[in-house]
């Protein structure tokens, strides 16, 4: 059974997560951003289920397009660099969701914007860390 | 069950305009793309422009000056028209649905001829 | 725009024999990839989305692999209904482009 401690632990990386996610939804959305029309383009796989941690798989999976289309985004609207960016959030990933078990992720026909993908993910975090509290 | 069907003139004079009708059943305008592509006789597969859930598009550069798609959600129907018809655009029009799975209509032929 | 080479263009090949068909795009893709299998006549069927995911009612003998630029289409035993064109389409930039297609015959 997880302890209160690991439980915190948890706590903290989501809201880790849910912060990042948020910033770069809101760099992306930014009125000054010129290139939301040309990364509205791209289509990101979202998760059939998204409701415990080990669904994150269907995140991690989705990292390095996600790389790809913030690198379109002038940086300034972030405060790091996508690469960083997005290495931070894989390494938050990797220890929510854990190497024990191999997980296959299974993936909706629907496919979302870059600004869809964002806000799933954020209310995954929202959802999760609602149940810890 | 998912069904794209289009249907289409059969034969435009050159010069002429080309307009194509794609209904589709089974899910909602809303939720997703469609594209169109198209296939010359005995040729490869073209792919034209798309139309995004929110209407917005994105053609083809080849097409960008001809080319306009349309949609009416409450219709369940995307339209394609193109413009300046010559006897090179002679091919089966197909819409698509996109998606991680692609669902494809059959086709409509059009033959571009005097 | 992001190219997509199809290879080979035709091939022949004798009942039983492993058939293998190379797409590589111009950059990376993300698996985003489908492989389409088309006989004269009919529209093109879809037999493999997401670079690897075999779709419901294509034969096992069919599978899809690769990452980054280059995915491969295999079919591990030809078997006669299996003479047709195939051809690859990314997904991932628009224009949403195709392979210029594989003819596949029988020895």
């Known amino acids: 059974a997880p302890t209160s401690s690991s439980t915190k632990k948890t706590q903290l990386q989501l809201e880790h997560l849910l912060l990042d996610l948020q910033m770069i939804l809101n760099g992306i959305n930014n009125y000054k951003n010129p290139k939301l029309t040309r990364m509205l383009t791209f289509k990101f796989y979202m998760p059939k289920k998204a409701t415990e941690l080990k669904h994150l798989q269907c995140l991690e999976e989705e990292l390095k397009p996600l790389e790809e289309v913030l690198n379109l985004a002038q940086s300034k609207n972030f405060h790091l660099r996508p690469r960083d960016l997005i290495s931070n959030i894989n390494v938050i990933v990797l220890e929510l969701k854990g190497s024990e078990t191999t997980f296959m992720c299974e993936y909706a026909d629907e496919t979302a914007t870059i600004v869809e993908f964002l806000n799933r993910w954020i209310t995954f975090c929202q959802s999760i860390i609602s149940t810890l509290t | 069950e998912v069904q794209l069907q289009e249907s289409g003139p059969g034969l435009v004079a050159p010069s002429q305009s080309l307009s194509i009708t794609c209904t589709v059943s089974?899910?909602?305008?809303?939720?997703?793309?469609i594209s169109w592509i198209r296939q010359p006789p005995g040729k490869g597969l073209e792919w034209l422009g798309v139309?995004?859930?929110?209407?917005?598009?994105n053609y083809n550069s080849g097409f960008m000056s001809r080319l306009s798609i349309t949609k009416d959600n409450s219709k369940s129907q995307v339209f394609l028209k193109m413009n300046s018809l010559q006897t090179d655009d002679t091919a089966i029009y197909y819409c698509v649905r996109q998606g991680r799975t692609p669902y494809w209509g059959n086709g409509t032929l059009v033959t571009v001829s005097a | 725009d992001i190219q997509v080479t199809q290879s080979p263009s035709s091939l022949s090949v004798s009942l039983g024999d492993r058939v293998t068909i190379t797409c590589k795009a111009s950059k990376d893709i993300y698996n985003r990839l489908a492989w389409y299998q088309q006989k004269p006549g009919n529209a093109p069927r879809l037999l493999i989305s997401g670079a690897t995911s075999l779709e419901t009612g294509v034969p096992s003998r069919f599978s899809g692999s690769g990452s980054g630029k280059d995915y491969t289409l295999t079919i591990t035993s030809l078997q006669t209904e299996d003479v047709a064109t195939y051809y690859c389409?990314?997904?991932?930039?628009?224009?949403?482009?195709f392979g210029g297609g594989t003819k596949l015959e029988i020895k």
């Open positions: 139309i995004w859930t929110g209407g917005g598009t």
């Open positions: 089974g899910f909602s305008l809303t939720n997703y793309d």
């Open positions: 389409q990314q997904f991932w930039g628009t224009p949403y482009t």
